[in-house]
Interface confidence: low
């Protein structure tokens, strides 16, 4: 199908014209402009950047660009009462203190308003006690400690290394284990790539570098004080005691120089195995407490951060559709950063800016997309996806009726090895077809397609000759659109060759060293990877907004549903006796998946044959495609997670960054052998199979012939 047919525009205004207008040099220039000072959410600097982007998007040619503001709960350190951790002797004297700030990178020594490292939303407190090293503080790490090693974290301060899972899950796990404080640190094993120098001489984390980040467990709620509703001028706010997702114990992050000083004295139990050892010159003893000579010394945390309701600003730009203005394709990424945001988010924001400029250029030449494109610069993503979630809460009725797709645009790069895509199965074919048309930027793949280099470097584990595409999890602004509203979503960026370290981020993530120079010197000097990501993100938006028939293939959903059903069944079959005792059957789910597969196949045949010149039938077929993702939404949500409503996908309960399939069944089965009431536990498994089977069957029926 030709994208041109949509609005009877001249042939030069096709996808190629849009892609050819994207320029690496512009992305580079925009990145420089966005990274010269910090743009922390809730600050004047970030408000000024919002107004600058609003003005520039108007100049680029969008029909309208508005600021949407909300008053949400944010968290900041106390400038006169800094946070730190100390080792104290038996007299209470502080014999070692962690650093109060990161040494600024060259050229940035005189920049003001660099927020010192802190864990956003940590409560205030000054707990002191023995230290317990808990590895990554994952669910399985606490199982190992408590069940196998019989180590009790109750009343202890735990120290955990960053990586593998979202930091909020670490804090939640520590709270559940009874800890009274959490110290998070970056171990060189996870944040120092062998053979690469530390910043400013390379892209590795120096010993004084620290990862900032929020430690909430919002489960999709948005602003902690106004869950489910926008934090507008007349909002009713919960008291802080009823706020959603706030941690109850003090938390603070440190770098590996400081971590060395705490960990080198650790005594108690030896690490259970080599997977608990990082790369510091310490024994990685678990504790509790310090060894021999140091056994009377304790660790004390000094946390004085405050939570404040603060105004944030989204920028929302509109390019009205010529044929279906009431159908929205959204491209959104955040603008707020922890410090300079060299990668996160401005490498993404610069790409969005260039995509807007290219679309604006086409519009000035008389072109319009078939459907409306909305562009968003979200605020306060770093504080819990707040800007995007509040806007979606405010506009939920419009979005659930009109939302075709959401494409996320945070960091464009986390490496420079190959493409990484996470998306709904509906977009698999779109991504495959698009990347076959784009040139690979990779060395050794000159003249080859992006699809070819991507497939070679990141092959699908299931299908030979195809690239890996991952499930959507969370930890970014697509969450509300996909997990709550059921709008087909996707994200793309360039990544590293580091599959085992998937959720640890790049070494300088959320540190002061995430600068323009980091990108320009070490990651992408020619900005060719940024350009490729702009082509992928922009190309997806162009096709979604302009193709006559929506570029969704429902058959790909059928394939993954079967795979996910097989996977969850095999997990359950680890308990054959209980399945027999409690009459647990997956027949209903497999039957629903079979029906979905057959109906999707028939729908796809009709899609090939129908009369595309009939606007009513065209709209009807497109609506069936648009609403398919919506059909997987359960209005009641998942157990204890009402804002995660997608039955097929949810963020893992053990790692917000990761996606889990059939999450309701998965969570019901998780650790089921330890449940005190097995009859009740297996009853919940059966209920979740019922919900999943019903949802898949109901979704299938939305694809049936309407009459």
């Amino acid at each position: 199908k030709s994208s041109n047919e949509a609005t009877n525009i001249t042939p030069k205004h096709n996808m190629k014209a849009f892609l050819d207008e994207l320029k690496a040099e512009n992305i580079k220039k925009f990145l420089y402009n966005f990274t010269q000072i910090p743009h922390l959410a809730g600050t004047e600097q970030n408000f000024q950047l919002a107004k600058q982007i609003q003005s520039q998007w108007k100049e680029f040619g969008l029909d309208s660009v508005e600021l949407a503001h909300y008053d949400v709960l944010l968290s900041y350190p106390n400038k006169t009462h800094p946070n730190y951790i100390s080792i104290i002797n038996e007299d209470g004297n502080e014999i070692f203190n962690t650093s109060l700030f990161e040494p600024p990178p060259p050229g940035y020594e005189n920049v003001s308003d660099i927020v010192p490292p802190f864990s956003a939303f940590s409560p205030q407190g000054m707990p002191e006690g023995d230290l317990v090293y808990v590895n990554y503080a994952r669910t399985e790490d606490f199982f190992k400690l408590e069940r196998d090693m019989k180590i009790n974290c109750s009343g202890k301060i735990v120290i955990a290394r960053y990586g593998k899972v979202f930091r909020g899950n670490k804090v939640k796990n520590a709270q559940l284990a009874g800890a009274k404080g959490v110290i998070l640190y970056s171990d060189p094993a996870d944040y120092f790539a062998p053979g690469v120098k530390s910043y400013p001489d390379g892209w590795n984390l120096p010993g004084g570098g620290v990862q900032r980040g929020n430690i909430l467990n919002l489960n999709g709620a948005g602003d902690p004080l106004t869950p489910g509703y926008p934090a507008n001028e007349y909002a009713y706010r919960r008291g802080i005691a009823e706020a959603v997702g706030l941690p109850s114990i003090p938390v603070h992050p440190i770098g590996y120089y400081d971590a060395q000083k705490l960990l080198e004295k650790m005594g108690g139990s030896a690490p259970p195995d080599s997977s608990w050892r990082g790369s510091l010159k310490v024994p990685y003893n678990v504790g509790p407490g310090f060894t021999g000579n140091f056994s009377t010394q304790k660790v004390k945390m000094h946390i004085h951060s405050t939570n404040e309701v603060t105004r944030i600003y989204n920028v929302i730009g509109t390019l009205r559709g010529a044929v279906e203005p009431d159908r929205y394709v959204i491209l959104g990424g955040h603008r707020d950063s922890w410090v300079f945001g060299g990668i996160d988010p401005q490498s993404g924001a610069a790409v969005v800016h260039e995509i807007v400029r290219s679309f604006g250029t086409l519009k000035k030449e008389g072109w319009r997309p078939r459907r409306t494109i909305l562009f968003a610069s979200w605020d306060a993503e770093e504080f819990g996806l707040l800007g995007s979630t509040e806007w979606a809460e405010e506009n939920s009725r419009l979005l659930q009726e009109r939302g075709v797709a959401y494409i996320n645009a945070d960091s464009s790069i986390e490496g420079n090895y190959t493409l990484r895509v996470d998306c709904t199965p509906l977009m698999y074919s779109l991504v495959h077809n698009l990347t076959k048309e784009l040139k690979s930027p990779d060395e050794g793949f000159e003249g080859k397609s992006l699809y070819e280099s991507w497939t070679k470097k990141s092959p699908s584990p299931e299908f030979s000759g195809m690239p890996r595409i991952s499930k959507l999890g969370s930890g970014n602004d697509f969450e509300v659109f996909f997990q709550r509203l059921g709008i087909a979503s996707g994200r793309a960026r360039y990544t590293k060759n580091w599959e085992t370290n998937k959720f640890s981020g790049y070494p300088l993530y959320h540190s002061v060293y995430e600068t323009y120079e980091l990108v320009e010197k070490f990651y992408d000097p020619m900005f060719k990877y940024h350009l490729t990501v702009a082509q992928v993100r922009g190309g997806m938006v162009f096709e979604l907004a302009n193709s006559i028939v929506l570029p969704f293939d429902c058959r790909d959903y059928a394939v993954v549903l079967r795979k996910y059903a097989d996977k969850i069944y095999s997990i359950s079959m680890k308990h054959p006796q209980e399945m027999k005792t409690y009459s647990v059957s997956f027949d209903s789910l497999f039957s629903a998946v079979k029906n979905f597969t057959e109906i999707a196949s028939k729908f796809s045949e009709r899609l090939q044959d129908f009369d595309k010149s009939n606007p009513i039938v065209l709209r009807m077929m497109n609506d069936q495609l648009m609403f398919l993702e919506r059909a997987f939404i359960d209005p009641l949500g998942l157990p204890d997670r009402p804002f995660y409503r997608h039955v097929i996908y949810a963020p893992s309960s053990h790692n917000k960054y990761a996606g889990e399939s059939f999450p309701g069944i998965y969570d019901a089965l998780f650790d089921i052998e330890s449940k005190v009431d097995p009859s009740k536990a297996w009853g919940e498994v059966k209920r979740q199979i019922y919900v999943a089977a019903f949802t898949v069957q109901a979704a299938a029926e939305t694809l049936s012939e309407v009459a």
């Epitope: 060189p188 690469v196 510091l280 310490v282 024994p283």
Partner: antibody
Framework: EVQLVQSGAEVKKPGSSVKVSCKAS????????ISWVRQAPGQGLEWMGG????NYAQKFQGRVTITADESTSTAYMELSSLRSEDTAVYYC???????????????????WGQGTLVTVSS | DIQMTQSPSSLSASVGDRVTITCRAS??????LNWYQQKPGKAPKLLIY???SLQSGVPSRFSGSGSGTDFTLTISSLQPEDFATYYC?????????FGQGTKVEIK
């Protein structure tokens, strides 16, 4: 796969110097941490020194110099004021791990050259 | 400088035997201890790094344990190709140092 290929055997007079080369292939040379280890006939292994960070065993201090030419991916070990007890096989080795600029984190000598026999005899 | 002491200096064993070699450091080296195997006329080969991690391609009958100052290399069931000299080496602090070696001979 990384390979280290050393220069050929040498016969030297006491008091002279010897310079052994070690060419690396199959990876980024700048990320290698090259060390030199020697083994006298019938004796054990003796670490002489290494780069990244540069450090020499006390026993060889002032007599050994370890250098590298990144453009040719070649490391060199020069030992001066040779004596008969310097007769040994000299190995060029890669240490796995890295140097952070603060600590070194090395986990073993995982790639070895084939060895160069240096004989010191009058 | 850190001294490494291996024991025994030699041992005789038969195929199928369980063999244990110990290595002691003069001060704590955490887990920065590596084990090598050397056969006559050949370069040494890394077996175990970081006290207990098996180098890729090394048979699972080799295992290492210990941390701090005392370390052990164990061959669970000696095979004909395992008769060789074994060295420990510390990579905690430069200058690095080797143990004097343990020769495993056929009984």
């Amino acid at each position: 796969e990384v390979q280290l290929v050393q220069s050929g055997a040498e016969v030297k007079k006491p008091g002279s110097s010897v310079k052994v080369s070690c060419k690396a292939s199959g990876g980024t040379f700048s990320s290698y941490a090259i060390s030199w280890v020697r083994q006298a006939p019938g004796q054990g292994l003796e670490w002489m020194g290494g780069m990244t960070p540069k450090n020499y065993a006390q026993k060889f201090q002032g007599r050994v110099t370890i250098t590298a030419d990144e453009s040719t991916s070649t490391a060199y070990m020069e030992l001066s004021s040779l004596r008969s007890e310097d007769t040994a096989v000299y190995y060029c080795v890669r240490a796995s791990g890295y140097y952070s600029g603060y600590h070194s984190y090395y986990y073993g000598l995982d790639v070895w050259g084939q060895g160069t026999l240096v004989t010191v005899s009058s | 400088d850190i001294q490494m002491t291996q024991s025994p200096s030699s041992l005789s064993a038969s195929v199928g035997d369980r063999v244990t070699i110990t290595c002691r450091a003069s001060q704590s080296i955490s887990y920065f201890l590596n084990w090598y195997q050397q056969k006559p006329g050949k370069a040494p080969k890394l077996l175990i790094y970081a006290a207990s991690s098996l180098q890729s391609g090394v048979p699972s009958r080799f295992s290492g344990s210990g941390s701090g100052t005392d370390f052990t290399l164990t061959i669970s069931s000696l095979q004909p190709e395992d008769f060789a000299t074994y060295y420990c080496q510390q990579s905690h602090t430069m200058p690095w140092s080797f143990g004097q070696g343990t020769k495993v001979e056929i009984k």
